[in-house]
């Protein structure tokens, strides 16, 4: 049967992103719509066809734009995503013979890690702590010299979608871990990244 | 020239089942819809369905309940509809046509289907 | 499914007249209307997609317009080849209905 071919995307806060559907048929459909997937119903967008061209929906006029004009290859271009655009997305081609043919194209939106990693000296043990914020939520791992080091880890969800983790090392002998490298380790979205410190004596 | 030739008129008995082809040429197959109508004496045009010749996917009219099947032959360019459990009442014309979207440009010549004991 | 009556069923007219044929269809069905003529044992013949648009190789003299449920086909100027069965389709819907015809007749 007659199908359309969708790709998911996953975009960075705060920039362009666009999503593609391209029906696999002989022929062109008669109009494009594309509507964003609710609880209760799809909402309207932007419609595409040769007769009106294209007619985005005023709740969309400055965020979107139909960025390829096809009847057959449709793309809708979002100019600067924001958290509330992230969602599923339904293109229905309009087509003569075989009606109304959809494909789904999904929106992720995520936020780079902000990490920040910092130590302090209390009188007989030293608190070494890694902070890292984003969106999907980042895992924080601990590279030590040595074994047996105990850590915890707080993890806060914020207003704006983003969730920190936060993870402290114990470290029970600082005079040990002078001078020796320690690696905060924050897995986001399948890339780790290291962050490394020195302890000094203060 | 672009042509759609139909295969001859048939007469048929209640009960039996036809199958009419319609031999594109003069285009490439594959970039039109074929879709049949047919015409009982004296009566409107009835549309039967259609089939994207590219992919093979059809559409039918809910009407004649599975009666009828499209196919098509890409390698001879040559749709075929076929209508089973034939009635007095399928006595008709039966038309192919070609179109892009909804464009339709060229039709065949027209069979006539009897059916009758 | 969706009834397309048309109307008049025939009219008679004559060589050089305007005539108008109206199609109304029992529900909204946008823009997504064809007109098509018919002689006496012979194929249909396009003339009008999508409500308004000339297949090539029709004369001007025929126009279609209309959108939603109300249609019309109009020809400025009978010539004496129009004398046919003219018939409308919808195909916003499955199954795509025709009207039931109008019979254009030489007065």
């Known amino acids: 049967q007659v199908q359309v071919v969708t790709q998911d995307e996953r975009e960075q806060l705060y920039t362009p992103a666009s999503l593609k559907c391209s029906l696999q048929n002989a022929q062109e459909a008669l109009i494009v719509t594309w509507q964003k997937k609710k609880a209760v119903s799809p909402e309207n967008m932007v419609t595409f066809s040769e007769n009106h061209g294209v007619v985005i929906q005023p709740a969309y006029k400055d965020k979107i734009n139909i960025t390829q004009l096809g009847l057959q290859n449709s793309t809708i271009t979002f100019w600067n995503i924001t958290l509330e655009d992230e969602g599923c997305y339904m293109c229905l081609f309009n087509t003569f013979g075989f009606g109304k043919i959809s494909g789904t194209a999904c929106l992720t939106v995520y936020v780079q890690p902000i990490v920040s990693l910092h130590y302090k000296f209390s009188e007989d043990h030293l608190n070494i702590t890694c902070s890292a914020t984003a969106r999907p939520a980042p895992m924080v791992f601990w590279k030590v010299p040595r074994s047996g080091i105990e850590n915890s880890t707080v993890t806060l969800s914020h207003p704006n979608g983003t969730t920190s983790v936060t993870s402290i090392l114990h470290i029970k002998d600082p005079k040990n871990q002078v001078g020796k490298e320690v690696i905060c380790q924050v897995l986001h979205l399948g890339t780790v990244t290291d962050f490394k410190q020195t302890v000094n004596k203060g | 020239q672009v042509q759609l030739v139909q295969s001859g008129a048939e007469v048929k008995k209640p009960g039996a089942s036809v199958k009419v082809s319609c031999k594109a040429s003069?285009?490439?197959?594959?970039?039109?819809?074929i879709l049949w109508v047919r015409q009982a004496p004296g009566q409107r045009l009835e549309w039967m369905g259609h089939?994207?010749?590219?992919?093979?996917?059809?559409n039918y009219n809910l009407k004649f309940k599975g009666r009828v099947t499209i196919t098509r032959d890409t390698s001879a360019s040559t749709a075929y509809m076929e209508l089973s459990s034939l009635r007095s009442e399928d006595t008709a014309v039966y038309y192919c046509?070609?179109?892009?979207?909804?464009?339709?440009?060229?039709w065949g010549q027209g069979t006539l289907v009897t059916v009758s004991s | 499914d969706i009834q397309m009556t048309q109307s008049p069923s025939s009219l008679s007219a004559s060589v050089g007249d305007r005539v108008t044929i109206t199609c109304k269809a029992s529900?909204?069905?946008?823009?997504?209307l064809s007109w098509f003529q018919q002689k006496p044992g012979k194929a249909p013949k396009s003339l009008i997609y999508?409500?308004?648009r000339l297949v090539d190789g029709v004369p001007s003299r025929f126009s279609g317009s209309g959108s939603g449920t109300d249609f019309s086909l109009t020809i400025s100027s009978l010539q004496p080849e129009d004398f046919a069965t003219y018939y409308c389709?919808?195909?916003?819907?499955?199954?795509?209905?025709f009207g039931q015809g109008t019979k254009l007749e030489i007065k």
């Open positions: 089939i994207d010749p590219y992919y093979g996917s059809s």
């Open positions: 003069g285009y490439s197959f594959t970039d039109y819809i």
């Open positions: 389709l919808q195909y916003d819907e499955f199954p795509y209905t």
């Open positions: 046509a070609r179109s892009k979207r909804d464009y339709f440009d060229y």
């Open positions: 999508r409500a308004n």
């Open positions: 529900q909204d069905i946008n823009s997504y």
